[in-house]
Interface confidence: low
């Protein structure tokens, strides 16, 4: 507000009166001035701040015929439908020459039935879980006493005797309604009625029961659901991308989750069609007729490795005298884990099989015993992961090497005199 000067020659001859009434009241405040010369514009202040959008009218009447004679100015401020925001100290302000003059103040007050500043809101709560409801009302006149009602039944013997602004509810087992009454000397006002919907508690102890490469069996403990039986539980699984960053309490997964519904009881579910050796995050929520519980936190789980689902591909075995060159390609079928290497077995018609671990190489040169006269030599290859061997390839007979056929140099592997491994199932 501008600086004011309360000089002796204040132009004000009438100051705003006081208005006190109930909400919705209409009233008028007036200021009267006597000024010499051109009359000024009258501004209204509320609590020292200029009212930019005041509903004011100004009437000015000259007391003589000369412009330099005195004028009487009356400014009226109309307050329509009195609200709390209208209350305060009202003054008129005028600029005259280089001086600012401010009227004596008038006050606008409110008095009537209690007015709610805050009312109980609809909300959902978990069964048997404490929560608070808020209700706040004011006059004037003060004091304002509150009386809470649950399902239309008062929670105290009289207004002001029970909880006031905040009602602590230790827990509900059924959906209920709450309201509050505000009492003052002028009467009673009733708040809106809030519906508190009782949902199941968040399930607890979500855990893995068993793991297979493409399925996980999970179980959980249901929370209380009040008088409403659980109808089903919903499990979500989402692939855990390393950069995905699902936090313990993150509300939504970053991609569309795999959602499964479980009839309850039992509180257990087998999640199938998963990728082997893959990290997932899972969570569960349970639903009653009133609605779903909150989700559990995301639980990190992982499917175990499986064995490769197919044998190595495109196996070729070529013989040149006492050497045999074998090479192959990685299985086209899913590996179901991290490929650790290949096993190779070869066997002649009347000789014991020889088993070798080749590691991750995809080719090997075998140094055959003797002059290489072993007949009907066949080779089989299998890929393996930490979970074990995948299926062996069909036996591939060694073909004689023909001139012009490429024979790259490879590390030679001497055939041991006895089988390197014993594979009873071979």
């Amino acid at each position: 507000a501008p600086r004011g000067t309360q000089a002796e020659e204040s132009p004000f001859v009438g100051n705003p009166g006081n208005i006190t009434g109930a909400r919705g009241l209409t009233g008028t405040l007036r200021c009267q001035l006597q000024v010499q010369g051109e009359p000024p514009e009258v501004h209204w202040l509320r609590d020292g701040q200029i009212l930019e959008l005041a509903d004011s009218t100004q009437t000015q009447v000259p007391l003589g015929e000369d412009e330099q004679d005195d004028w009487i100015v009356v400014s009226q401020l109309r307050i329509t439908s009195l609200q709390l925001s209208d209350t305060g100290q009202y003054q008129c302000l005028v600029f005259l020459g280089h001086q600012t003059f401010v009227s004596q103040p008038g006050y606008v007050g409110l008095e009537g039935l209690p007015y709610f500043l805050e009312e109980p809101e609809d909300r959902t709560v978990a069964a048997n879980t404490p929560f608070n409801l808020s209700c706040q009302a004011q006059g004037p006149p003060e004091p304002v006493d509150l009386l809470w009602l649950q399902d239309a039944v008062p929670l105290a013997t009289a207004p002001g005797h029970g909880p006031q602004r905040s009602l602590h509810v230790p827990g509900l087992n059924k959906t209920s309604s709450f309201s509050c009454e505000a009492h003052n000397a002028k009467g009673v006002t009733t708040s809106r009625t809030a519906t508190i919907t009782v949902l199941p508690q968040q399930p607890r102890n979500l855990h893995l029961v068993s793991r297979q490469p493409t399925e996980l069996e999970v179980a959980w403990t249901p929370g209380l659901s009040g008088i409403y039986p659980l109808t089903h539980c919903t499990l979500q699984a989402v692939l855990s991308d390393d950069g995905m960053g699902i936090q313990a309490g993150e509300p939504d997964p970053p991609e569309e989750p795999l959602t499964s519904q479980a009839s309850v009881p039992p509180h257990q579910l087998r999640l199938g069609s998963l990728h082997p050796h893959t990290p997932y995050h899972i969570r569960v929520a349970c639903t009653s007729s009133q609605g779903p519980s909150s989700w559990t936190h995301w639980l990190p789980v992982e499917t175990p490795e499986g064995v490769p689902l197919g044998p190595p591909e495109n196996i070729s075995a070529t013989r040149n005298g006492s050497q045999a060159f074998v090479h192959w390609q990685e299985p086209r079928a899913p590996l179901q884990g991290t490929l650790l290497g290949y096993r190779l077995a070869y066997q002649g018609q009347d000789t014991p099989e020889v088993l070798m671990d080749i590691g991750l190489r995809q080719e090997v040169t075998l140094e055959l015993q003797g002059d290489g006269s072993v007949s009907n030599l066949t080779v089989c290859v299998a890929a393996y992961t930490a979970a074990g061997d995948g299926p062996w390839s069909l036996p591939v007979p060694l073909e004689a090497w023909r001139p012009g056929q490429a024979q790259p140099v490879h590390q030679l592997v001497k055939e041991p005199s006895t089988p390197a491994f014993s594979w009873p199932w071979w």
Partner: antibody, heavy 120, light 107 residues
Framework: EVQLVQSGAEVKKPGATVKISCKVS????????MNWIRQPPGKGLEWIGL????????SYNQKFKGRVTISADKSISTAYLQWSSLKASDTAMYYC?????????????WGQGTLVTVSS | DIQMTQSPSSLSASVGDRVTITCKAS??????VAWYQQKPGQAPRLLIY???TRHTGVPSRFSGSGSGTEFTLTISSLQPDDFATYYC?????????FGQGTKVEIK
């Protein structure tokens, strides 16, 4: 409930710099102003400056300008007063105070005070 | 800058007395005057602003008045809890200035 909680007492040597904090709760931190006032032992109140956290705008008492920096971190609802080139005469209780919504220059809620002692 | 001159610097009074403290502004400030109460070891507490508006929770025995450059804080009936130091402050424009304080002591 409106609360302004200030950092603990500080003992500094002349020429040093001190930074004290004022964490607010119970109201919108960015709504009004935060004033800083000091009171030497047994003496009156002296306004240092203010900040409007919503835009970082500051106003300082010219007497202290150059040695004082007022700042605010909206994310943690905290205002700071940094005072450099401390002198023994800067020994005082330093208060943060919230500007009243009807006049930002009237102070309705105050911190408990931070005693800064400057001594060699 | 608006200077605030407060008087008296101290006064002795008894419980039930009417106490008046005055503050004079060096220039008019549109009634932008606040009054604070401070007890030893405590932060100041706002009593009055805009010269006469009581802050929330302040007992009605505290009242402010004045306009132009002369402002008064009145305690209509002094209570034991009212023995403290009182400060006026102009809150019209920066730099904000305080009066020197008035210490109200038990007679």
């Amino acid at each position: 409930e409106v609360q302004l909680v200030q950092s603990g007492a500080e003992v500094k040597k002349p020429g040093a710099t001190v930074k004290i904090s004022c964490k607010v709760s119970g109201y919108s931190f960015t709504g009004h102003t935060m004033n800083w006032i000091r009171q030497p032992p047994g003496k009156g109140l002296e306004w240092i400056g203010l900040i409007k956290p919503s835009n970082g705008g500051t106003s300082y008492n010219q007497k202290f300008k150059g040695r004082v920096t007022i700042s605010a971190d909206k994310s943690i609802s905290t205002a700071y007063l940094q005072w450099s080139s401390l002198k023994a005469s800067d020994t005082a209780m330093y208060y943060c105070a919230h500007g009243h919504y009807e006049s930002y220059f009237a102070m309705d809620y105050w911190g408990q005070g931070t005693l800064v002692t400057v001594s060699s | 800058d608006i200077q605030m001159t407060q008087s008296p610097s101290s006064l002795s009074a008894s419980v039930g007395d009417r106490v008046t403290i005055t503050c004079k502004a060096s220039q008019d400030n549109s009634s932008a005057v606040a009054w604070y109460q401070q007890k030893p070891g405590q932060a100041p507490r706002l009593l009055i602003y805009w010269a006469s508006t009581r802050h929330t929770g302040v007992p009605s025995r505290f009242s402010g008045s004045g306009s132009g450059t002369e402002f008064t804080l009145t305690i209509s009936s002094l209570q034991p809890d009212d023995f403290a130091t009182y400060y006026c402050q102009e809150h019209f424009s920066t730099p904000l200035t305080f009066g020197q304080g008035t210490k109200v002591e038990i007679k």
